[in-house]
């Protein structure tokens, strides 16, 4: 769940709110679990910097020690820096906490790039701009790391919000959200609004930026427009979903839908990019290249290695196609689609040499571990992780970056047959083989 293409990711200033609010459909209101309506105290509780992750402020221990914690729906450990490190301004000091309990167990977590290890314990944890509760949670105190912490990222730990099945060292280590729900009356649901910057940030802006909202225990209607569409969580490990069709500017990629989910498709706030399986990536790039052929870009751009720049304010958004992913719906043979704009999949980065230009990286990349719907997707939408009903909801985000011609969209229903066949069944292997596949 980390680094390179997997976490960290990007954040920044909230994009301009939509001037026009679509009328809210009310047919699903009664289905929503948890508190409804306004969660004022949790709105804008996420911050971050471009490409470096969205973090929430948390406190651990007694007396409380404040830390910024990266929000990661692609892992399941709550882990915090607990020893001095050149990139950390502060870290969890267990010896100063009267409520810390040592579990006398170690944990090691490798990512595609980067890794960390630490000691397991429990302590009291709260989220100042979250629900007014304190819970005893498992904490991995990170004592050693390599390419995990990021210089200047401003976060000191990671909050894994996925399920126990992928927790390290094994599934007996209860994840934070499970502890929260068990120990309080908070409904088993959270939602994320990640607000991409939409333009390169200079240092001052980046530090001051608000990055979005993590609503714990429900849904805040001010954070989205239109209606929420839900897709089933296929299996409770990662937040695994099933993609049934992919279109580039309305043109079907026409691949066997199993390819889209090979070997899984997950929703992961700890990944920057939209990552696609090799075959799907190649087909998608070919189609995006064809659609944007009025301008030529170097191969390095499509590989995510090179920037492309335009004079400030002249980015030709219109030459780039929209990308639509069709997700399995809650009703048999019914799907819905989520559509992102180039404003989501072209990631703004500051090019020091040409700071008067607007520069971007192509934020769709190749994966060997399935489709990863990272920040590139999530920044277009308000995403509801309805664990209680084993489903994930998508609605157009009130803060997504768009232009006067196109907007991100969530639309349905569409008739799609045999969607169950789109899921890939991973061959049963021993646990160690399974876990090393995490990226």
């Amino acid at each position: 769940t980390h680094l390179g293409i997997r976490l960290p990711l990007r954040s920044g200033l909230a994009g301009p709110p939509l001037g026009l609010r679509l009328p809210r459909e009310t047919d699903e209101e009664s289905e929503e679990p948890g508190r409804r309506g306004s969660f004022v105290e949790m709105v804008d509780n996420l911050r971050g910097k471009s490409g470096q992750g969205y973090y929430v402020e948390m406190t651990v221990g007694s007396p409380p020690q404040t830390l910024n914690i990266l929000v990661d729906t692609g892992s399941s450990n709550f882990a915090v820096g607990a020893a001095p490190h050149p990139f950390l301004h502060r870290y969890y000091q267990r010896q100063l906490s009267s409520t810390y309990r040592d579990l006398r167990k170690g944990v090691y977590v490798p990512y595609t790039q980067g890794k960390w290890e630490g000691e397991l314990g429990t302590d009291l944890v709260s989220i100042p701009h979250g629900p007014n509760v304190t819970v005893r949670a498992n904490i991995a105190a990170i004592t050693e790391s390599d390419k995990f912490f990021i210089n200047g990222s401003n976060w000191e730990g990671i909050l894994g919000l996925a399920y126990a099945e992928i927790a390290r060292p094994d599934d007996s280590l209860e994840p934070f959200f499970d502890s929260l729900v068990k120990q309080t009356h908070i409904p088993n649901i959270f939602s994320l609004q990640l607000c991409g910057a939409g333009f390169p940030l200079n240092q001052t802006e980046a530090l001051a930026s608000v990055g979005g909202s993590m609503i714990i225990g429900g849904i805040d209607h001010s954070l989205y427009t239109g209606r929420l569409w839900y897709t089933p969580i296929r299996r409770e490990w990662y937040y695994e979903v099933i993609i049934v069709r992919v279109e580039i500017n309305g043109q079907d990629l026409k691949m066997d839908c199993k390819e889209y989910n090979y070997d899984k498709s997950i929703v992961d706030s700890g990944t920057t990019n939209l990552r696609l399986p090799k075959k799907v990536f190649e087909a998608a790039v070919k189609s995006i290249k064809a659609a944007s052929s009025t301008e030529k870009f170097p191969d390095g751009f499509w590989l995510g290695e090179q920037l492309v720049c335009w004079q400030a304010g002249t980015t030709p958004w219109n030459i780039f196609p929209v990308i639509s992913l069709y997700l399995m719906g809650e009703v048999t043979n019914q799907s819905f689609r989520i559509t992102i704009l180039p404003q989501q999949y072209l990631r703004p980065v500051e090019d020091v040499a040409t700071s008067q230009d607007d520069c971007y990286k192509f934020a769709v990349s190749q994966s060997s571990t399935g489709t990863v719907m990272g920040a590139v997707i999530m920044e277009g939408f308000y995403v509801v992780f309805d664990r209680a009903r084993k489903r994930i909801g998508f609605a157009v985000s009130a803060c997504h970056v768009h232009d006067e011609f196109r907007t991100a969209a969530v639309e349905g229903p569409f008739v799609t047959a045999d969607m169950e066949d789109c899921g890939y069944n991973i061959p049963q292997t021993d646990e160690s083989t399974l876990m090393t596949g995490r990226a």
Epitope: Y108, P110, K115, T143, P169
Partner: antibody, heavy 124, light 107 residues
Framework: EVQLLESGGGLVQPGGSLRLSCAAS????????MSWVRQAPGKGLEWVSA????????YYADSVKGRFTISRDNSKNTLYLQMNSLRAEDTAVYYC?????????????????WGQGTLVTVSS | EIVLTQSPATLSLSPGERATLSCRAS??????LAWYQQKPGQAPRLLIY???NRATGIPARFSGSGSGTDFTLTISSLEPEDFAVYYC?????????FGGGTKVEIK
């Protein structure tokens, strides 16, 4: 070839102190966790202490916690065990062992090879 | 602390016979268990790590199995050089602990 050579053992009175050293060669010392394990005469093995590659993480058996200190000098490729308040039950051959990586918990990161050991005798 | 109980304490066998050594943990150690061999006057050497993986240079006649609380080291056909003391060790929890050892002696 990996070589680990322990030194610093000997006879010491109860309550006394000793500092064991383990000189390492044949590998990039700073990239590997290290450990001390002891074996009382005619008895089994007992893990004593471990330290991560950077030296940032240290761990001890309950029987030595607060009395022994593990440390390393990566510039000198040397591992140390400072032993204070020694007791008769600390009498043993002390082995240093190289970890499988800089990590203490990584799969496969077990301790091998071991040095030949140095004998510590605590007696009045 | 996790207690590792090895059985039998002594195993008397002839060369060519199959040796089965047991190690039982007082609580689950997942697969964080290894086996070491120690000959008189020598330092221990790693045979099996992570319950079932043979260490570099260890002959195929040595195999490990098990996970959780019950583990087995099997020597399919004893060679003269295999007569030694065998220890299991866990590093799932602190403190890391060794079993009491099984001595494999010539019958």
């Amino acid at each position: 070839e990996v070589q680990l050579l322990e030194s610093g053992g000997g006879l010491v009175q109860p309550g006394g102190s000793l500092r064991l050293s383990c000189a390492a060669s044949g590998f990039t010392f700073s990239s590997y966790a290290m450990s001390w394990v002891r074996q009382a005469p005619g008895k089994g093995l007992e893990w004593v202490s471990a330290i991560s590659g950077s030296g940032g993480s240290t761990y001890y058996a309950d029987s030595v916690k607060g009395r022994f200190t593990i440390s390393r000098d990566n510039s000198k490729n040397t591992l140390y065990l400072q032993m204070n308040s020694l007791r008769a039950e600390d009498t043993a051959v002390y082995y240093c062992a190289k970890g499988g990586s800089q990590w203490l918990y990584a799969p496969g990161s077990w301790f091998d090879p071991w040095g030949q050991g140095t004998l510590v005798t605590v007696s009045s | 602390e996790i207690v590792l109980t090895q059985s039998p304490a002594t195993l008397s066998l002839s060369p060519g016979e199959r040796a089965t050594l047991s190690c039982r943990a007082s609580q689950s150690v997942s697969s964080y268990l290894a086996w070491y061999q120690q000959k008189p006057g020598q330092a221990p050497r790693l045979l099996i790590y992570d319950a079932s993986n043979r260490a570099t240079g260890i002959p195929a006649r040595f195999s490990g199995s098990g996970s959780g609380t019950d583990f087995t080291l099997t020597i399919s056909s004893l060679e003269p050089e295999d007569f030694a003391v065998y220890y299991c060790v866990q590093r799932s929890n602190f403190p890391w602990t060794f079993g009491g050892g099984t001595k494999v002696e010539i019958k």
